[in-house]
């Protein structure tokens, strides 16, 4: 079997809220029953993790509670919100899929998202 | 041959439930053999087929500890055990110094 | 093995029997140590490692390239596949001195 192959695109822009959503999409090798998707930040050479969650295949993508993605499932494909991001969170998001069951597990590793996020200007002082 | 034996490995200075854990091992003046690997919260697991059936990996995550119970040993089992951690990206990019075991008769 | 001088380019072969796109990684040994990671996704250096070292390649090829050989360097070379399980390594090369 070939390596997994992980599609995301290439930019996205914050809404002002500070949200961001793109979608994860996986060319799987194998029948996998469970998915595991990570959200990892890639800063200079530094890459660390921002969110993952497991899930079984026909079920719902389950973050942790005080988590700051939210995501849902549909077949291969996998659309993740990133909420509270502000303008120093600006950076390249990459999502990495793992097929953990059944055996052989398979890695799947995206060329990741850039996410622009800017900073909503503070409203004006109104004499009204 | 034929014993048991029980190797652990503790990690500090990470996140040890974020990462897999690999045992990797290397017969004496040979090269380096896949062992096992045990991911996150220690449900998914994996064996070299050389190991399958003999070797069983597990961690604890709150002991930050890694574990391979190694059954039936061989005098082929004799090598040194590596643990290495995978790195978010997907490689092993911190390993432990190495424990030697040796299966004679 | 590959004998070769201080100063002198090492240029190492990997070749995996079915394509593992980029999810390889390149690791040196010294005797009586650890393996330590020097090159991930076929072509990234690892934190700490000196730009002498690069990587090359894609699918089932692959080359880690050392410019100019420092008297560190001479070891042992070890390609792994890390995209699915078995995580099978390479047979290793070992790089010593002319």
């Known amino acids: 079997c070939k390596a997994m192959h992980v599609a995301q695109p290439a930019v996205v822009l914050a809404s002002s809220r500070g949200i961001a959503s793109f979608v994860c999409e996986y060319a799987s090798p194998g029948k996998a029953t469970e998915v595991r998707v990570t959200v990892l930040r890639q800063a200079d050479s530094q890459v660390t993790e921002v969110c993952a969650a497991t899930y079984m295949m026909g079920n719902e993508l389950t973050f942790l509670d005080d988590s700051i993605c939210t995501g849902t499932s549909s077949g291969n494909q996998v659309n993740l919100t990133i909420q509270g991001l502000r303008a120093m969170d600006t950076g390249l998001y990459i999502c990495k899929v793992e097929l953990m069951y059944p055996p052989p597990y398979y890695l799947g590793i995206g060329n990741g998202t850039q996410i622009y996020v800017i900073d909503p200007e503070p409203c004006p002082d109104s004499d009204f | 041959p034929g014993r048991s034996l029980r190797l652990s490995c503790a990690a500090s200075?990470?996140?040890?439930?974020?990462?897999?854990i690999h045992w990797v091992r290397q017969a004496p003046g040979k090269g380096l053999e896949w062992v096992a690997v045990?991911?996150?919260?220690?449900?998914?697991?994996d064996y070299a087929d050389s190991v399958k059936g003999r070797f069983t990996i597990s961690r604890d995550n709150s002991k930050k500890t890694l574990y391979l119970q190694m059954n039936s040993l061989r005098a082929e089992d004799t090598a040194v055990y590596y643990c290495?951690?995978?790195?978010?990206?997907?490689?092993?990019?911190?390993w432990g110094q190495g424990t030697l075991v040796t299966v004679s008769s | 093995t590959l004998s070769l001088s201080p100063g002198e380019r090492a240029t190492l072969s990997c070749r995996a029997s079915?394509?593992?796109?980029?999810?390889l990684a390149w690791y040196q040994q010294k005797p009586g140590q650890a393996p330590r990671l020097l090159i991930y996704?076929?072509?990234s250096r690892a934190t700490g490692i000196p730009d002498r070292f690069s990587g090359s390649g894609s699918g089932t090829d692959f080359t880690l390239t050392i410019s100019r050989l420092e008297p560190e360097d001479f070891a042992v070379y070890y390609c792994?596949?890390?995209?699915?399980?078995?995580?099978?390594f390479g047979p290793g090369t070992k790089v010593d001195i002319k």
């Open positions: 996704g076929a072509s």
């Open positions: 045990i991911w996150y919260d220690g449900r998914n697991k």
């Open positions: 792994q596949q890390y995209g699915r399980s078995p995580f099978t």
């Open positions: 200075g990470f996140t040890f439930s974020s990462h897999g």
């Open positions: 079915q394509s593992v796109s980029s999810y």
């Open positions: 290495a951690r995978v790195a978010p990206l997907g490689p092993l990019d911190y």
